[in-house]
Each structure stands twice: as C-alpha cells, then as structure tokens.
C-alpha cells in the first residue's frame, strides 16, 4: 500500500515562522522582531563550544 | 477586497485625550499585524507603531516618540482596531492612518484627522 | 533612528519622460541572511492615502504598472518611473522596515509640466 508524504516540507527545510514576510524570527527570544534587530553570528574559532547562534529565518512568501 | 476604515477623529483640546478606531473587513482579523501612521498637514509621514497578529499573541511595537502616550489596541471580535491617545500636544495634529502589515505597509485607510488645540 | 533622505523634494517632467528619484539611508537595510534590503516606497497621489508600490526595494505590489521600477542596496535606493503619465502626479515616500521605528524620508513630489 502507498503512503502519501509524511511532510509536505524537506527534512532540512526550515520549519515555517509565525512572522509576517516583514520581520524575521528571533529563535533566542522566540518571535518576531524587524530584521535588523538579528546579527548574523560570527564563526568561532574551531574547538569554541557556545549556545546555538541567533539567527533568523525568513517566511517564504 | 481589503478594506480599512478609520474614525475617532475631530477636535481636542491640549491635555486631552482620544479614540480612534480602524474598522476591518476583508481579511481575516487575526491573522495579520495592523499599524498606525500619521501625517501633520503638509508633511511626511511617522510611523507610530503596530500590533502583531494572534500567533504572536498581539505584542506590540512603538515609535519611541510615542510611547507611553498612545497605546494601539484590537477588537477581534468586532474587526475592529484601535488606536488610544493621552495627553495629547499640539503636535499630535494630523491625518491618522491605519495600514494592514504584511511585506511592509501593505493596505492604508482613507484616514481621520485630528485636531489638538485650544 | 534610521534616518531616510530623499531627493529631489520636487521635480517638475513631462508626460513620457523617464524619471528617478533618490532615496538614502544613514544605515545600511540590507539583511545579509536572506539578501533582502527592508525598504518600501509609496505613493501618495492629492488628497488620498498611500499607496504601496514597491517592497524589499525591487519588488513590484501586485497590480502596480511595469513603469515603476525600484533598484538600489545597503544605504542607496532609487525610484525609477520608466514613461511618466499624467496620473503619476503624486509624492513618492521611501521607507525603512529594517528596525524599529520604521522611518519615512521627507518625500519626492512628481509635478507634470
């Protein structure tokens, strides 16, 4: 018997955001904020542990 | 069709306070942030702030000129969204508008005008 | 605040010439992540509310005509109306959504000569 697709997102898609398209999601604070308020993270030096970097993701339109 | 309708808008004296309401139909009300911006007479226009949707539970954003003087406010079951403004100046005189949020400021109302003097 | 300036404050053309107007800002908009420059420009035609016609800088709002064209990043944007008409007579605002609080420049007024 088929299946249908257990998702209609890859498994490495980014998971959809409650952001309306002019903001972006903050995942250290958890909601929306304007873009320019995230920094994207520098790289660390190899070997540095640190908690997972702010980042944003972008709703696609 | 998008359609925004303000009202509230008149005369008040220096100190005063006022109510404008932006009246939603169209779109589903909970589903999309609604901002307000004004216009002094023959001016440019000053975003004041908006209010997120349902999903991010109605948090709001302000201008800091603002703050702490106007406080933006919805009635979801009444479509309806506001815009609640103390101790008003001088200043504060101008056509008041309400926009839906979505790529930027997506849909404006006609606006109401509000007048502060004495 | 991000402070958004515009030029010309005015500009008198006739109806079929190309004409560009200038918007800057005193910090960059563009969103490295996503590539997306957070500026919108508006028109505001006499007596009536503005109008959304381009976003994240270069895209076009549905239903607005192929003769506005929006280009530019980072801290330089520019309004370009490729055929002017009559009915463009209108003030033409930018504005940034990149952080708060969203900031207008002082606007561009289209005259038809």
């Known amino acids: 018997m088929r299946r249908g697709p257990r998702s209609l997102r890859g498994r490495d898609a980014p998971a959809p955001t409650p952001c309306v398209p002019a903001e972006c999601f903050d995942l250290l604070v958890a909601h929306c904020v304007a873009c320019g308020l995230l920094r994207t993270p520098r790289p660390k030096p190899a070997g540095a542990s640190s908690p997972a970097p702010r980042t944003a993701l972008q709703p696609q339109e | 069709e998008v359609k925004l309708v303000e009202s509230g808008g008149g005369l008040v004296q220096p100190g005063g306070s006022l109510r404008l309401s932006c009246a939603i139909s169209?779109?589903?009300?909970?589903?999309?942030?609604m901002s307000w911006v004004r216009q002094p007479p023959g001016k440019a226009l000053e975003w004041l702030g908006f209010?997120?949707?349902?999903?991010?539970?109605?948090?709001?954003e302000y201008n800091p000129s603002v703050k702490g003087r106007f406080t933006i406010s919805r009635d979801n079951s009444q479509s309806i969204f506001y815009l609640q403004m103390n101790t008003l100046r001088a200043e504060d005189s101008a056509t008041y508008y309400c926009?839906?949020?979505?790529?930027?400021?997506?849909?404006w109302g006609q606006g109401t005008t509000v007048t502060v003097s004495a | 605040d991000i402070v958004m300036s515009q030029s010309p404050s005015s500009l008198a053309v006739s109806v079929g010439e190309k004409v560009t107007m200038s918007c800057k800002s005193s910090?960059?908009?563009?969103?490295?992540?996503?590539?997306?420059?957070?500026l919108a420009w508006y028109q505001q035609k006499p007596g009536q509310s503005p109008k959304l016609l381009i976003y994240?800088?270069?895209t076009r709002e549905s239903g607005v005509p192929d003769r506005f064209t929006g280009s530019g990043s980072g801290t330089d944007f520019t309004l370009t109306i490729s055929s002017v008409k009559a009915e463009d007579l209108a003030v033409y605002y930018c504005?940034?959504?990149?952080?708060?609080?969203?900031?207008f420049g002082g606007g561009t007024k289209l005259e038809i000569k």
């Open positions: 926009a839906q949020v979505r790529r930027a400021l997506d849909y």
């Open positions: 169209g779109f589903t009300v909970t589903a999309y942030y």
């Open positions: 209010i997120r949707d349902k999903a991010n539970g109605y948090t709001t």
């Open positions: 910090q960059s908009l563009l969103y490295s992540s996503n590539q997306n420059n957070y």
């Open positions: 994240w800088a270069s």
């Open positions: 504005q940034q959504y990149y952080t708060y609080p969203y900031t």
